[in-house]
């Protein structure tokens, strides 16, 4: 990968560095619940209160995705290979990386009911 991240997982889904808790990194998924028809588009938005804006990288199933940094991850033309859990990592010069909660992205075939929540291991 372009860069490797070492994450200390925390029950809140954050990756705090140092002794104080940092403001949460919010991950918003559209469509809500993260379930989409094959070929559909999912948009993940990483909202970070910190100023100036930190660099945002993306993870899938705990592994960094080889994508340019961006606060928004657009996943078009979703297929079976893209199902999994996604999270964002915010890196700020003044402290280490913070990881968001993970959201589950899944494909729903026509006629199926999608999950009610797309959150995995934390809120």
């Amino acid at each position: 990968m372009g860069s490797s991240h070492h994450h200390h997982h925390h029950s809140s889904g954050l990756v705090p560095r140092g002794s104080h808790m940092l403001e949460e990194v919010q991950l918003v998924v559209e469509p809500e619940g993260g379930a989409v028809a094959p070929g559909g588009t999912v948009t993940l938005t990483c909202e970070v209160p910190a100023q100036p804006s930190p660099q945002i990288h993306w993870m899938k199933d705990g592994v960094p995705l080889p994508l340019p940094p961006s606060p928004v991850l657009i996943l078009p033309e979703i297929g079976p290979q893209d199902q999994g859990t996604y999270s964002c990592v915010a890196t700020h010069s003044s402290h280490g990386p913070q990881e968001s909660r993970a959201v589950s992205i899944s494909i729903i075939e026509p006629g199926e009911e999608g999950p009610t929540a797309g959150s995995v291991g934390g809120s």
């Epitope: 372009g2 080889p66 340019p68 991850l73 996943l75 033309e77 297929g79 290979q81």
Partner: antibody, heavy 120, light 107 residues
């Protein structure tokens, strides 16, 4: 339909710079990435880097970090690669390709290529 | 960087013959591999994505498969337009890397 139209061939002097364009049409420019690839005459393909037109974020092959600058203009749906301090090693065809973070979208569509010739 | 070792570099075959091209990855790339076709005029077209998924409009004689770190492109019955260049591409991690290419020639 998706199209990536690249600018025409360039003949440039050593030590100068050149800017190659890749105009996208037929899709939402901000929703996809643009990759840049180099092919020397009679040789294989080499990945230069990628830009997210929506955020402006880039990643480069270390080999091209100084050589290549990637930019995108959202208003014209056009991506650019600027190559600086040109030498004969930069003589090549440069391709852009449309990509995204999903398997089905990775390097799915390619421009026709732009030949850059560096010669005194 | 991940090395993609492509073989053979050139291959002579006859119309109707079945051929396979192989790329070996130096590190784990999962299913993050494409096969590309390049025409003599330089035009590049993707044939296979994610190791084995066929692009729309690509003839069914093309197929992709994986065995461990070896990735194969198979053409079940060669047609005249297939005698061009082929490349594999891994997009599992930066920097993305290509195989060195296979030139398919008519016997």
């Amino acid at each position: 339909q998706v199209q990536l139209q690249q600018s025409g061939a360039e003949l440039v002097r050593p030590g100068t710079s050149v800017k190659v364009s890749c105009k996208a049409s037929g899709y939402a420019f901000n929703n996809y990435l643009i990759e840049w690839i180099k092919q020397r005459p009679g040789q294989g393909l080499e990945w230069i880097g990628v830009i997210n037109p929506g955020s402006g974020g880039t990643n480069h092959n270390e080999k091209f970090k100084v050589k290549a600058t990637l930019t995108a203009d959202k208003s014209s749906s056009t991506a650019y690669i600027q190559l600086s301090s040109l030498t004969s090693d930069d003589s090549a065809v440069y391709f852009c390709a449309r990509s995204a973070g999903t398997a089905r979208a990775r390097f799915a569509y390619w421009g026709q290529g732009t030949l850059v010739t560096v010669s005194a | 960087d991940i090395q993609m070792t492509q073989s053979p570099s050139s291959l002579s075959a006859s119309l109707g013959e079945r051929v396979s091209l192989t790329c070996r990855a130096s590190q784990d790339i999962g299913s993050s591999l494409n096969w590309l076709q390049q025409e003599p005029d330089g035009t590049i077209k993707r044939l296979i994505y994610a190791t084995s998924s066929l692009d729309s409009g690509v003839p069914k004689r093309f197929s992709g498969s994986r065995s461990g770190s070896d990735y194969s492109l198979t053409i079940s019955s060669l047609e005249s337009e297939d005698f061009v260049d082929y490349y594999c591409l891994q997009y599992a991690s930066f920097p993305f890397t290509f195989g060195s290419g296979t030139k398919l020639e008519i016997k």
